[in-house]
């Protein structure tokens, strides 16, 4: 049903009115306003921006806008004792030092409080030793080093290129390999698109540019000192030794000019194959240590950053629902940035601001949504999703009972090629239907729908004529809502052409060069892609908050469950002999998926036919839809990851950014051939199949007729 059938909505106040009110020029103006100075989490500047947003959201017409503060563990460089890396000679003299800061972009030379590049939460230390180049420091890279090349990283400083996987996973892998320090760098192969100039003349990373970022392995815990509970005034805090997810070895990021100086001297083993070579004019030798003439030289890290409990501020705005005020649709994105945040996060925050303004305009004209809409400006996302997680921990009882959906709103763009959507299968049909109604901003698709350009440029690998929609992973503020609480979630942004641009993320990610001018000059001068993303995000929120029947299709979950079951079965079948030996069967899982499919189909039929004028039945059906995502939550969580509780999806254990399906089974099967006790390992596989089958069956039963 269309939105304008909801209670007390005049024909004027429908989705079209909301979308028409969104203006590219406003998004541009908001982006400029949000990016003139740094807004690092825990700083006065970011507190002032929180208060500004609170004030403006009130002016826009929200019913209430409050600040929610928490005292969480953050990390900062020592202002008087900078972090750097040296090459030292046999006498211990520093003969080369990496740069202490990024050369500031034009127009920003006099800006104060630009935090120098650092790896947030690195411990202090000054390790020195031989260097080992470990490619991307992925699980498979360490397998190649240790198992195939017999190279031991124990007691070595490793240098890894950014990209492919979350930096925290790289550090964890290096720690497990016995390294005593990690140097992260941006290789031009991953952060320099051919044929494009470096900033300020283009959108590529200059040699002195460096990616900041946290290196935690929180696994959804939020504040490292208060896992599971809000970091409020009366919180009990763990000691730093018991803190969740902190790295144990020093880590520091550098740019490719500095990396060249370290890598050009590398000796030892040649790279195992061309996939280990980047684009620098260096041999990409693995090491350990430097080549002949330089073999007595070592690398020394100087890391003096400190971890500090610091106050952060979320801004929470409420637009009360007219009919179901106890049902919450949440639009949230973060406000804190590493430096100027030209893309991350302010291209998203500017879009949220304009969405709030549009909703506020409608509200001032007498309209209200059917359900309550909550708007959030999260703090400390860059330090481990802390603001969103602490707020969700504080409000978990309300959220698990009342949370309909969460739409994330970080960076609106990471390119300007086509749309990118990651969401729960429940939202597939919502996204399809919405994008069919929106105009494409793409060149060559004038007068065509967004759905059409998106499908053409990013086709689904499985279904012809449909666009690709990806699994949710993590690395952003939807994590606690989806992976811990089981609230249906989605995210949308404009992205690059993944086929022609193989660099990871966008080149200037988390660098000082992520400025307003980067967006205005190179990515989206007309702000038409930002406007499209605002229409997608805002349109999803509008429909979720306003449609009489929730716009969730449970049949799409049935389809993916079958696909995921097939996939995990085929992984297991790479070990046919062991499956036979240990009597491993997937019958229970396939049976549960079959039951889910049948029950979902019958539920969908009932959804078409029931009496929508009966508020009790309507509420009952909507609750079944709302609670379906919740039904995939296992209260015990995944093994060793208690805050990842979704049985169908979790962030990959090898890459936080990526989503893994049936993660419990997947992890049990991973590298199973190397396990010392195969009987125990296959026993765990069987247990995980049992948990997955039970959960799918239990979820199916929530869709059965209630009596």
């Amino acid at each position: 049903k269309s939105s304008n059938e909801a209670t007390n909505i005049t024909p004027k106040h429908n989705m079209k009115a909301f979308l028409d009110e969104l203006k590219a020029e406003n998004i541009k103006k908001f982006l400029y306003n949000f990016t003139q100075i740094p807004h690092l989490a825990g700083t006065e500047q970011n507190f002032q921006l929180a208060k500004q947003i609170q004030s403006q959201w009130k002016e826009f017409g929200l019913d209430s806008v409050e600040l929610a503060h928490y005292d969480v563990l953050l990390s900062y460089p020592n202002k008087t004792h900078p972090n750097y890396i040296s090459i030292i000679n046999e006498d211990g003299n520093e003969i080369f030092n990496t740069s202490l800061f990024e050369p500031p972009p034009p127009g920003y030379e006099n800006v104060s409080d630009i935090v120098p590049p650092f790896s947030a939460f690195s411990p202090q230390g000054m390790p020195e030793g031989d260097l080992v180049y470990v490619n991307y420091a992925r699980t498979e890279d360490f397998f190649k080093l240790e198992r195939d090349m017999k190279i031991n990283c124990s007691g070595k400083i490793v240098i890894a290129r950014y990209g492919k996987v979350f930096r925290g996973n790289k550090v964890k892998n290096a720690q497990l390999a016995g390294a005593k320090g990690v140097i992260l760098y941006s290789d031009p192969a991953d952060y320099f698109a051919p044929g494009v100039k470096s900033y300020p003349d283009g959108w590529n990373l200059p040699g002195g540019g460096v990616q900041r970022g946290n290196i935690l392995n929180l696994n959804g815990a939020g504040d490292p000192l208060t896992p599971g509970y809000p970091a409020n005034e009366y919180a009990y805090r763990r000691g730093i030794a018991e803190a969740v997810g902190l790295p144990s070895i020093p880590v520091h990021p550098i740019g490719y000019y500095d990396a060249q100086k370290l890598l050009e001297k590398m000796g030892g083993s040649a790279p195992p194959d061309s996939s280990w070579r980047g684009s620098l004019k260096v041999p990409y030798n693995v090491g350990p240590g430097f080549t002949g003439n330089f073999s007595t030289q070592k690398v020394k890290m100087h890391i003096h950053s400190t971890n500090e409990v610091t106050r952060i501020y979320n801004v929470i705005g409420t637009l009360r629902g007219a009919v179901e005020p106890d049902r919450y649709v949440i639009l949230g994105g973060h406000r804190d940035s590493w430096v100027f945040g030209g893309i991350d996060p302010q291209s998203g925050a500017a879009v949220v601001h304009e969405i709030v303004r549009s909703f506020g305009t409608l509200k001032k004209e007498g309209w209200r949504p059917r359900r309550t809409i909550l708007f959030a400006s999260w703090d400390a996302e860059e330090f481990g999703l802390l603001g969103s997680t602490e707020w969700a921990e504080e409000n978990s009882r309300l959220l698990q009972e009342r949370g309909v959906a969460y739409i994330n709103a970080d960076s609106s763009i990471e390119g300007n090629y086509t749309l990118r959507v990651d969401c729960t299968p429940l939202m597939y049909s919502l996204v399809h239907n919405l994008t069919k109604e929106l105009k494409s901003p793409d060149e060559g698709f004038e007068g065509k729908s967004l759905y059409e350009s998106w499908t053409k440029k990013s086709p689904s690998p499985e279904f012809s004529g449909m666009p690709r929609i990806s699994k949710l992973g993590s690395g952003n503020d939807f994590e606690v809502f989806f992976q811990r609480l089981g609230i249906a979630s989605g995210r949308a942004r404009y992205t690059k052409n993944w086929e022609t641009n193989k660099f990871s993320g966008y080149p200037l990610y988390h660098s000082v060069y992520e400025t307003y001018e980067l967006v205005e000059k190179f990515y989206d001068p007309m702000f038409k892609y930002h406007l499209t993303v605002a229409q997608v995000r805002g349109g999803m929120v509008f429909e979720l908050a306003n449609s009489i029947v929730l716009p969730f299709d449970c049949r799409d979950y049935a389809v993916v469950l079958r696909k995921y079951a097939d996939k995990i079965y085929s992984i297991s079948m790479k070990h046919p002999q062991e499956m036979k030996t240990y009597s491993v069967s997937f019958d229970s899982l396939f049976s549960a998926v079959k039951n889910f499919t049948e029950i979902a189909s019958k539920f969908s039929e009932r959804l078409q036919d029931f009496d929508k004028s009966n508020p009790i039945v309507l509420r009952m059906m909507n609750d079944q839809l709302m609670f379906l995502e919740r039904a995939f939550i296992d209260p015990l969580g995944l093994p060793d990851r208690p805050f990842y509780r979704h049985v169908i999806y979790a962030p990959s254990s090898h890459n936080k950014y990526a989503g893994e399906s049936f993660p419990g089974i997947y992890d049990a099967l991973f590298d199973i051939e190397s396990k010392v006790d195969p009987s125990k390992a296959w026993g765990e596989v069987k247990r995980q199949i049992y948990v997955a089958a039970f959960t799918v069956q239990a979820a199916a039963e929530t869709l059965s007729e209630v009596a």
Partner: antibody, heavy 120, light 112 residues
Framework: QVQLVQSGAEVKKPGASVKLSCKAS????????INWVRQTPEQGLEWMGG????????NYNENFKGRVTMTRDTSNSTAYMELSRLRSDDTAVYYC?????????????WGQGTTVTVSS | DIVMTQTPLSLPVTLGDPASISCRSS???????????LNWYQQRPGQSPRLLIY???NRFSGVPDRFSGSGSGTDFTLKISRVEAEDVGVYYC?????????FGQGTKLEIK
């Protein structure tokens, strides 16, 4: 605007040494190697070697080893090239040139050249 | 050392006509990372050399698009689509794949 400014012309006697300077501006000196290239009508352009200002590491062309010494002073962003035991065939224009680093890995900026005349 | 051989050594051209210079290296200039560090320099009369083309075919900033480079392995070409008066000078190919870096003998372009 990247600039390399070289010292003035030199006249030397055979067997003497000459030390040329190259002052860099408009960029971060320690990020880019400085090459020295000489030009004679007979030999054309000839790469003599290079220095990494960051760590002082040098790389010399075998043809000049034992006679050439490259140094740098990072405090004033200046590179130096000293050529000893001069011969008449060392008469040439000597250029310093910045090694452009990624993505170029070519000499992307050149000094104006210093004429060295070796004559008895 | 890698020997770079240019042909022709002298190239008289009519204004507006195309010009082509060849450069051959004594061994492959492909570096282990897959890139080929073959560069072209222009030296106008009385001036220092200036970078025109890097990595075989990439124009350096400010270089007009009438200049183009091509080739692979050991055989390379510099083309000028329509020669202008300011193009007069000596053109050098050079390799920075292997140490020592080496240059071709130069090709003198003059106007007929």
């Amino acid at each position: 605007q990247v600039q390399l400014v070289q010292s003035g012309a030199e006249v030397k006697k055979p067997g003497a040494s000459v030390k040329l300077s190259c002052k860099a501006s408009g960029y971060t000196f320690t990020y880019f190697d400085i090459n020295w290239v000489r030009q004679t009508p007979e030999q054309g352009l000839e790469w003599m070697g290079g220095i990494s200002p960051g760590d002082g590491n040098t790389n010399y062309n075998e043809n000049f080893k034992g006679r050439v010494t490259m140094t740098r002073d990072t405090s004033n962003s200046t590179a130096y090239m000293e050529l000893s035991r001069l011969r008449s065939d060392d008469t040439a224009v000597y250029y310093c040139a910045r090694d452009g680093n990624f993505p170029y890995y070519a000499m992307d900026s050149w000094g104006q050249g210093t004429t060295v005349t070796v004559s008895s | 050392d890698i020997v770079m051989t240019q042909t022709p050594l002298s190239l008289p051209v009519t204004l507006g006509d195309p010009a082509s210079i060849s450069c051959r290296s004594s061994q492959s200039l492909v570096y282990s990372n897959g890139n080929t560090y073959l560069n072209w320099y222009q030296q106008r009369p009385g001036q220092s050399p200036r970078l025109l083309i890097y990595k075989v075919s990439n124009r350096f900033s400010g270089v007009p698009d009438r200049f183009s480079g091509s080739g692979s392995g050991t055989d390379f070409t510099l083309k000028i689509s329509r020669v202008e008066a300011e193009d007069v000078g000596v053109y050098y190919c050079s390799q920075s794949t292997h140490v020592p870096y080496t240059f071709g003998q130069g090709t003198k372009l003059e106007i007929k």
